[in-house]
């Protein structure tokens, strides 16, 4: 039979072309891409491949070693001068490791038939590749009809005698895929029908999407689908100390590429992303939520001595409201308002002040007015009560002024203007206020309400009364107006500094109407209601009677 080197013997050693070829070809990188998993690589098998040639004088293994003295498994056949060639080379059983689609990469050389003298009629430039699925590792079968053809393999580049002389080897690489596979493994078979071939390497592999960490989610090694257009949806799992709102998913393509990421993981509160992992926030730093990118320094007036803090602790005398975000500085109550001044107008007081020097670090400062009525003699103060009106309001004041109306006249008041903010109610400390003491102006007194008759005679009536409920100042005198009933136009007025009088020169057995009013520096109050008293008859004894209702 013709050899590939051009001689027509069947040498036991590899001819020159094989050496040249292997020296060139096998220096090519043996490493496979990370998304390819080899099921078989004839270049890396150290011992016997365990392949079978049938018939025995067809394909033959050429035993060579590379520069590291590792065996090189090369099969060649070159029966180009003989008709009806049917030489089979069967691999050992190859596990598919769960892959449903596998790839076969062949590296081979092929002699150009035109360069072979006298063999044009019988010489071929192709060979066939077949496979046979089997769960049985020992079920190698050489019945041709049980093998399924994968493809006819032709060379892109064939070599000539000239190439041999120039030591130029034209190595072909062909890749075919097979699928879907349904059994645990398979056998490959190479059929020569009269070509001059050297099969340098056979690599069988499947493609996977290699395990990857993306967006803090771990996606496992995933074998690609059987269909060349299929995208497999794969769920990822969040790395340590990370969480997700939307479960992470990616799609594994038939080519072993990860595509179309959906969702992501985020480092949980107290952890931040660094180099694809979630690292703990160190003391002095915090992260309140997974949605925040990185740990931040504690805000002013707060600290944390813990790792993995989700918030910081407020310093002594500083506070944080529940509604304050953890990124906000801790704050404290404000200092007292300053420079309070008052303006009294009769029974109204206008107060004005300037804001506290220290707002406690907050913008929500407001003011509260406490009103106390003080007894100038006893020095005792009491709450003013509900009759006082505050304009615009007593608490929650945003402006630095307020008006109090409906105060009592000629009364000592203490007003406490307190500054408060959002954390005042959290602080056990003393209230921060400025005090203003004022005395309201005197006003006309209120009416006299309580009048008692005293000694009544035929020509006189004695009366006594109590000071008005609200004198509104110092009572200077009382004015008593009286007239005979139904003769209102003819009245008499008596003035008295005391709370008793006697009206003289009255008619016996007559009804008289009395009205009393008090006067302060601010003027007279209104007259009291009418009180009617009757003088005694001429012959009656005088009487001393109690209070008239």
């Amino acid at each position: 039979p013709a050899s590939l080197a051009g001689c027509y013997s069947a040498p036991r050693r590899a001819p020159l072309w094989t050496c040249l070829l292997l020296c060139a070809a096998l220096r090519t990188l043996l490493a496979s891409p990370s998304n390819e998993v080899n099921l078989l690589d004839s270049r890396t098998v150290m011992g016997d491949l365990g392949w079978i040639a049938f018939p025995k004088n067809g394909w033959e293994e050429i035993g060579e070693v590379d520069e590291n003295y590792a065996p090189i498994h090369t099969y060649q056949v070159c029966k180009v001068m003989e008709q009806n060639q049917n030489n089979w080379l069967l691999t050992s059983w190859i596990s598919n490791e769960g892959a449903s689609r596998i790839f076969i990469e062949l590296k081979f050389t092929l002699r150009d038939c035109n360069s072979l003298p006298g063999g044009l009629g019988t010489c071929k430039e192709t060979f066939n590749m077949y496979y046979f699925e089997s769960d049985d590792q020992n079920g190698r079968n050489i019945k041709e009809n049980q093998y399924i053809k994968i493809d006819t393999i032709a060379a892109d580049e064939s070599f000539t005698e000239l190439d041999l002389g120039d030591r130029v080897m034209k190595l072909n690489t062909e890749v075919r895929d097979v699928g879907p596979l349904s059994k645990k493994g398979f056998y490959l078979a190479f059929q020569d029908v009269g070509a001059c071939i050297a099969l340098v390497s056979v690599r069988v592999y499947y493609k996977k999407c290699p395990s990857v960490v993306r967006h803090l989610a771990v996606f496992p090694d995933t074998i690609t689908g059987a269909d060349s257009s299929q995208l497999l949806e794969v769920s990822g799992s969040c790395v340590n100390h990370s969480v997700t709102d939307e479960p992470p998913k990616m799609h594994c393509s038939a080519e072993g590429e990860w595509l179309v990421p959906i969702g992501k993981c985020m480092c949980k509160a107290g952890y931040e992303e660094k180099n694809g992992t979630c690292q703990v926030c160190r003391p002095g730093f915090f992260k309140a939520s997974p949605h925040i990118q990185s740990c931040g320094k504690c805000p002013p007036h707060s600290y944390t001595h813990e790792e993995a803090s989700t918030s910081c602790v407020c310093e002594k005398d500083y506070f944080r409201r529940e509604s304050d975000p953890p990124t906000m500085a801790c704050t404290r109550p404000p200092s007292a308002p300053r420079n309070a001044i008052s303006n009294v107008n009769e029974t109204s007081v206008f107060l004005e002040w300037i804001p506290p020097a220290d707002t406690g670090g907050r913008k929500d400062v407001s003011y509260y007015i406490a009103c106390k009525k003080c007894n100038s003699h006893a020095g005792v103060c009491e709450e003013c009560g509900g009759h006082v009106r505050y304009l615009p309001r007593q608490s929650g004041l945003k402006n630095t002024s307020v008006m109090m109306v409906d105060l009592l006249a000629h009364t000592n008041y203490t007003f406490e203007i307190e500054a408060v903010n959002g954390v005042s109610d959290l602080s056990p400390g003393a209230r921060q206020y400025v005090s203003v003491n004022v005395t309201t102006n005197q006003a006309a007194p209120s009416p006299v309400t309580n009048v008692k008759k005293g000694k009544i005679a035929k020509n006189s009536i004695s009366l006594s009364w109590q000071e008005p409920d609200r004198p509104n100042g110092i009572i200077l005198e009382y004015e008593i107006k009286y007239f005979e009933k139904d003769q209102e136009t003819s009245y008499t007025i008596i003035k008295s500094k005391e709370t008793t009088i006697t009206a003289e020169g009255l008619k016996p057995a007559s009804v008289y109407v009395f009205q009393i009013r008090a006067r302060t520096a601010a003027g007279y109050g209104v007259f009291s209601r009418r009180f009617e008293f009757e003088t005694t008859p001429v012959f009656a004894a005088s009487s001393d009677q109690s209070q008239i209702p």
Epitope: P283, G284, K297, Y303, H305, E306, E307, A308, K316
Partner: antibody
């Protein structure tokens, strides 16, 4: 007023054990990290161990790792240092010190120290 | 571990003069823009006292004649006008990385 008071020091034989205490007052103990620092006679300061307020963060010096255990009881405002397998080189005054609140934190309050002597 | 080396081991300075103590760390003690370097003063028989934290921040209650500077691996404690009560040992300490190591100390004497 912030105060830290160490106790439990004394003479112990090599290989023996001792438990130091540090009583704290004048601050919210449970929110503060506390350190143990020691000083051998005539030598410099050596940091020993740290525990955070919630005991979630604990660090040790290599020289005491595996032999000393730092712990705390926040309900008693007390810090502890359990010292086992004591060696002569552990002889020192042991101080507890509070981690400060001004960032980046220093050790702002220290106890008066308690002397541990390891000798046969 | 980060090794802290102080220089000099001791120095004598006259009253009213400036005293400078250096501290070098075997690796940077900076993190996120801050230097985790503290300085302490210790008098014989007493507990140490914090003077400077974060390389340059004066602890409350410490006289302003004390100051700190530096970043990365090189730091300095300066006492601008020496007072009699400043005679003591001074220690630098890094708190950037566990273990929180101290320098060997510098003894300052008044001339």
């Amino acid at each position: 007023e912030v105060q830290l008071v160490e106790s439990g020091g004394g003479l112990v034989q090599p290989g023996g054990s001792l438990k130091l205490s540090c009583a704290a007052s004048g601050f919210t103990f449970s929110t503060f990290g506390i350190h143990w620092v020691r000083q051998a006679p005539g030598k410099g300061l050596e940091w020993v161990a740290y525990i955070s307020g919630a005991s979630t963060t604990i660090y040790y010096a290599d020289s005491v790792k595996g032999r000393f255990t730092i712990s705390r009881d926040n309900s008693k405002n007390t810090l502890y240092l359990q010292m086992n397998s004591l060696r002569a080189e552990d002889t020192a005054v042991y101080y507890c010190a509070r981690y400060g609140t001004s960032f980046p934190y220093g050790l702002d309050y220290w106890g008066q120290g308690t002397l541990v002597t390891v000798s046969s | 571990d980060i090794v802290m080396t102080q220089s000099p081991d001791s120095l004598a300075v006259s009253l009213g003069e400036r005293a400078t103590i250096n501290c070098k760390s075997s690796q940077s003690v900076d993190y996120d823009g801050d230097s985790y370097m503290n300085w302490y003063q210790q008098k014989p028989g007493k507990a140490p006292k914090l003077l400077i934290y974060g390389a340059s921040n004066l602890e409350s209650g410490i006289p302003d004649r004390f100051s700190g500077s530096g970043s990365g691996t090189d730091f300095t404690l300066t006492i601008s006008r020496l007072e009699p009560e400043d005679a003591a040992s001074y220690y630098c300490q890094q708190s950037n990385e566990d273990p929180f190591t101290f320098g060997q100390g510098t003894k300052l004497e008044i001339k």
